[in-house]
C-alpha cells in the first residue's frame, strides 16, 4: 500500500537537484581560486543534512550551520550590492562591474539560486512532487530558511557604503515583506555601515519622475535613519543605457542622466 505523502502548495524540488548543486559547486570553485580549497562533496553532504529526514515546515537556521561553515567566504565588505525584486539587472550589473557582489555571486548564493528543495520527515527521500509555499503552507521551509540565513549573514558582513537595487515599476518600490525589507535592512551593522544607497530602476521609457521621493522610499529612509545609518538614493531612468555606460563609462553620452 503506497504511503500517504503530504501535498504542499508549492512546486517540488528542482529535478536533478543533487547533481545541480554538486555541478555548480565544482564550477564555482574552478572559477574562484580563493574557494579552491572547498570540498564539494562535503558541501553537498552539509546541504543535504540541513533538510533531509526533517519536517519541511520545521527547518531552523541551526540546520544550515554546517553548510554555512563550509561555505564561509570573504567578499570585499564595501562592494556589496543588495537587490529586491530586480535580480536580473543586479546580476547583469555585477557581471560587468566585476568588483561588486550580490549574494548570488557568493558560493552559497550561487549554489541555490533559482532552485527549490525539500525533504520528508523520517525518510531520506527528496520530495520532487511538492514543497511548502511560504504563504500558503509555512515560512520555516527549507528554501525560505536558507535564504533568510544567507541573507542575514551577507548583510551582517557589509561595511562602508552598501548599495541596493530596487524595482521602480512595482507598486511597493520598497517592500517591508521582501527579504531585503525583512532581513537585510535589519541586519546591516550601524558600526560598520556608513550609508545605504538605493538605486531605483525605472521601467518606463520616458518616466522622468523622481522615484526617490516615493512614500515607500521615504519609509526605507526612516527605517535606515533610525538605525543610525545614512541614506542616499539615485534614480536609474534607463537601465539599458545604465548597463551600457557601466561597460563604457568614457562614452560621451554617459555624462547626462540615465
Amino acid at each position: 500500500v503506497p504511503r500517504w505523502r503530504q501535498q504542499w502548495s508549492g512546486p517540488g524540488t528542482t529535478k536533478r537537484f543533487p547533481e545541480t548543486v554538486l555541478a555548480r559547486c565544482v564550477k564555482y570553485t574552478e572559477i574562484h581560486p580563493e574557494m579552491r580549497h572547498v570540498d564539494c562533496q562535503s558541501v553537498w553532504d552539509a546541504f543535504k543534512g540541513a533538510f533531509i529526514s526533517k519536517h519541511p515546515c520545521n527547518i531552523t537556521e541551526e540546520d544550515y550551520q554546517p553548510l554555512m561553515k563550509l561555505g564561509t567566504q570573504t567578499v570585499p565588505c564595501n562592494k556589496i550590492l543588495l537587490w529586491s525584486r530586480i535580480k536580473d539587472l543586479a546580476h547583469q550589473f555585477t557581471q560587468v562591474q566585476r568588483d561588486m557582489f550580490t549574494l548570488e555571486d557568493t558560493l552559497l548564493g550561487y549554489l541555490a539560486d533559482d532552485l527549490t528543495w525539500c525533504g520528508e520527515f523520517n525518510t531520506s527521500k527528496i520530495n520532487y512532487q511538492s514543497c511548502p509555499d511560504w504563504r500558503k503552507d509555512c515560512s520555516n521551509n527549507p528554501v525560505s530558511v536558507f535564504w533568510k540565513t544567507v541573507s542575514r549573514r551577507f548583510a551582517e558582513a557589509a561595511c562602508d557604503v552598501v548599495h541596493v537595487m530596487l524595482n521602480g515599476s512595482r507598486s511597493k518600490i520598497f517592500d517591508k515583506n521582501s527579504t531585503f525589507g525583512s532581513v537585510e535592512v535589519h541586519n546591516l551593522q550601524p558600526e560598520k555601515v556608513q550609508t545605504l544607497e538605493a538605486w531605483v530602476i525605472h521601467g518606463g521609457r520616458e518616466d522622468s519622475r523622481d522615484l526617490c521621493q516615493d512614500p515607500t522610499i521615504k519609509e526605507l529612509e526612516s527605517i535606515i535613519s533610525k538605525r543610525n545609518i545614512q541614506f542616499s538614493c539615485k534614480n536609474i531612468y534607463r537601465p539599458d543605457k545604465f548597463l551600457q555606460c557601466v561597460k563604457n563609462p568614457e562614452d560621451s553620452s554617459c555624462t547626462s542622466e540615465i
Epitope: 545614512q230 539615485k234 545604465f242 553620452s253 542622466e257
Partner: antibody, heavy 123, light 112 residues
C-alpha cells in the same frame, strides 16, 4: 555636510605635470560624479572632465584629452586630476565639484565645490 | 560643443530693484524626458562658485526665493526680483545636457 578639500597651491615649470587632489567627506563618494573645472585669472569657468568613482573610467573634454588624467581612490574618498605638458596658459585655479542629484550618471548639479587650487606655470 | 552666450557682460544694479540675465545655447537643452539641462551658478568675490538653479527652473537648497530661473530649449533667463548687496558676483549659466559641459562667459553683477 559634504565637504571637498583640495591640495595646496603649486608652482610648476612649463613641460612638467601637476597632480591636484580632492578629498571628500560626509555622504557617499562612489556613486556621485566628481568633475574638475578650471578658471584662468580673470576668466570664466571651463569643465575639464569628470569621473564616477564606482565605475573608475573618466570622461574628458576633447580640449584636454591626452593631457589630463582623472582618477579616484574609493578607499580614501579622494579624486585626483593630473595635467601634463604644462604651459603658461594652464595657470589657473582648479576646482573639484561634486554632483548632488538623485539622477544617476549626472555631470553637473554641482552643489558641492572644493576651495580651489592655484596652479602657476612659470619658467 | 554647445556654445553658451550670456548677456549682458556687466550689470550695475540698485539694491531693491530687479535684475535679469539672459543665456542662449547654440542647441536645444530640452531633453526627451522634458527637462532643460541648464544650470545657473554665482561666484562671489574670492569664493568658489555655488549652484543657484538646476534643470532650468529649480532652486537649489538654501537659495533665497528672490532667485528664479525660466526658459526652455535655447533661451533662458535668471531673475533676481529684489537685488541685495550680498548678490554681487559673477553669474554663469552652464549646460549639462552633453559632454563637454560648457559655461557661458559670465555676467558681473555689481551695485551702482
Amino acid at each position: 555636510q559634504v565637504q571637498l578639500v583640495q591640495s595646496g597651491a603649486e608652482v610648476k615649470k612649463p613641460g612638467s605635470s601637476v597632480k591636484v587632489s580632492c578629498k571628500a567627506s560626509g555622504g557617499t563618494f562612489s556613486s556621485y560624479a566628481i568633475s574638475w573645472v578650471r578658471q584662468a585669472p580673470g576668466q570664466g569657468l571651463e569643465w575639464m572632465g569628470g569621473i564616477i568613482p564606482i565605475f573608475g573610467t573618466a570622461n574628458y573634454a576633447q580640449k584636454f584629452q591626452g593631457r589630463v588624467t582623472i582618477t579616484a581612490d574609493e578607499s580614501t574618498s579622494t579624486a585626483y586630476m593630473e595635467l601634463s605638458s604644462l604651459r603658461s596658459e594652464d595657470t589657473a585655479v582648479y576646482y573639484c565639484a561634486r554632483d548632488s542629484s538623485s539622477w544617476y550618471f549626472t555631470y553637473g548639479y554641482f552643489q558641492h565645490w572644493g576651495q580651489g587650487t592655484l596652479v602657476t606655470v612659470s619658467s | 560643443d554647445v556654445v553658451m552666450t550670456q548677456s549682458p557682460l556687466s550689470l550695475p544694479v540698485t539694491p531693491g530693484e530687479p535684475a535679469s540675465i539672459s543665456c542662449r545655447s547654440s542647441q536645444s537643452l530640452l531633453n526627451s524626458n522634458g527637462y532643460n539641462y541648464l544650470e545657473w551658478y554665482v561666484q562671489k568675490p574670492g569664493q568658489s562658485p555655488q549652484l543657484l538653479i538646476f534643470l532650468g527652473s529649480n532652486r537649489a537648497s538654501g537659495v533665497p526665493d528672490r532667485f528664479s530661473g525660466s526658459g526652455s530649449g535655447t533661451d533662458f533667463t535668471l531673475k533676481i526680483n529684489r537685488v541685495e548687496a550680498e548678490d554681487v558676483g559673477v553669474y554663469y549659466c552652464m549646460q549639462a545636457l552633453q559632454s563637454p559641459l560648457t559655461f557661458g562667459g559670465g555676467t558681473k553683477v555689481e551695485i551702482k
